[in-house]
Interface confidence: medium
Amino acid sequence: EEELQMIQPEKLLLVTVGKTATLHCTVTSLLPVGPVLWFRGVGPGRELIYNQKEGHFPRVTTVSDLTKRNNMDFSIRISSITPADVGTYYCVKFRKGSPENVEFKSGPGTEMALGAKPSAPVVLGPAARTTPEHTVSFTCESHGFSPRDITLKWFKNGNELSDFQTNVDPTGQSVAYSIRSTARVVLDPWDVRSQVICEVAHVTLQGDPLRGTANLSEAIRVPPTLEVTQQPMRVGNQVNVTCQVRKFYPQSLQLTWSENGNVCQRETASTLTENKDGTYNWTSWFLVNISDQRDDVVLTCQVKHDGQLAVSKRLALEVTVHQKDQSSDATP
């Protein structure tokens, strides 16, 4: 005769308030004859949850028909779960006896715990922008989850990061927990289009982690490089000087031209282009009248980027005698 086994496959069952919980229990033998009862707890204070033969259990229903002759499934459903329902549930086989049934064998128990999903992770970056090669910190927070076990990972453009610190609070027993993690990220010059991702995995999410993202474009400042050049060709009595402001981010930029230290107010032509990496290039053209110029003209292109200290590049204008002659000729 096969020895009776009481099989409760789930060690832990996470349930949500208001939902229905299914507690599984199957037996491997129909013998000995006698009922299967459900209890919460095993000690003297254990509580009867379901007895097919007697009692009133309005929130409990059976998964299969217990009146069927060969039934071996004694699983139950408990509806409208509340926090008071947490505990370990045991299905227990009793052997028919006189004057009363005798407890024969218990299942290993299924612990019912309240599960709560973590909130969508919120990722916050630094308050101020930082230049490449420097380290910035990002924080990720998620709240309201239970049980306490949770996994958090950081990614930058799909590559997992390792430099981070994570805390789950509180450390003791609680109805719900919060996680906070701070990751340190070294900025690269091409990070304008980069993203950091905080990924949270929890048993309540059934293998589908939650993600929070932050764009490094909010955290990075790529300072421009400046180049001032004089175009070899002149247009009539004017020489074209170009100031090229390359590879900067964000777009916020002020450019001014100075001629021998005097700021020029007149309009200049300019173009803004966006690079593949998300940085910008700005080109400004400045036309200098050379008809009445001396040899010592110094042009300065000054750029103030994103509220930082101004940077400038100077160019001593080369006006050849030939050009001067040409311009003299051109003067009526």
């Epitope: 707890g41 000690g43 003297p44 204070g45 254990r46 947490v86 505990g87 045991y90 407890e103 064998k105």
Partner: antibody, heavy 116, light 110 residues
């Protein structure tokens, strides 16, 4: 009517150890057996409880560290991976004929020493 | 986790005197009365004195009295005898199927 523990000895850390609680002189429809330990010069520490049907539950600190099981003649306590902090006298205690969580029959205890 | 706080940790009284030990639970015990008291002497296992908060165990003299309900319990030993010198523990039973002990109170009889 008595319970008696056995199996206590000197073990090295990490070596699993199983203690047995033998019940004699009882013919009961329902009873519960609890394992309790007492470190030298310290108080009583509840480990867990098992009923006649073999259903067991544990103190939260003891989950995973101990396993209580029932055979036809004994109730066993397995210390899965002992550490020096598990050095104590281990008692099994029986509750019968009452439904108040009290343990009215205690064994003399068995000493477990965990040391290198 | 449920915690039972016993006070005082040690108490001394003369033969014929009275000793009162308090046991406070961090949450209500099951059915408000799942509270037991034990006496333990050195080298011996604990002995049940009172169960159900106030019921005297078999063979225990009526000098021992248990009272209280819910979270607050008291053991009173009157007409103290030298044989009462021991450590006394309270034990609670909870709905979550946990049966922890208090920290113990040493009773010294002068």
């Amino acid at each position: 009517q008595s319970v008696e523990e056995s199996g206590g000895r000197l073990v090295t850390p990490g070596t699993p150890l199983t203690l047995a609680c033998t019940v004699s002189g009882f013919s009961l429809i329902s009873y519960y057996i609890s394992w309790v330990r007492q470190a030298p010069e310290k108080g009583l520490e509840y480990i867990g409880i098992i009923n006649i049907g073999g259903g067991a539950s544990y103190a939260s600190w003891a989950k995973g560290r101990f396993t209580i099981s029932k055979t036809s003649t004994t109730v066993d306590l397995k210390i899965t991976s002992p550490t020096p902090e598990d050095t104590a006298t281990y008692f099994c205690a029986m509750s019968y004929g009452m439904d108040t969580g009290a343990f009215n029959i205690w064994g003399p205890g068995t000493l477990v020493t965990v040391s290198l | 986790a449920q915690v039972l706080t016993q006070t005082p940790a040690s108490v001394s009284a003369a033969v014929g005197g009275t000793v009162t030990i308090s046991c406070q639970s961090s949450e209500s015990v099951y059915k408000n009365n799942f509270l037991s008291w034990y006496q333990q002497k050195p080298g011996k296992p604990p002995k049940l004195l009172i169960y159900g908060a106030s019921t005297l165990a078999s063979g225990v003299p009526s000098r021992f009295k248990g009272s209280g309900s819910g979270t607050q319990f008291t053991l009173t030993i009157s007409d103290l005898e030298s044989d009462d010198a021991a450590t006394y523990f309270c034990q609670g039973g909870y709905r979550t199927d946990i049966y922890p002990f208090g920290g113990g109170t040493e009773v010294v009889v002068k």
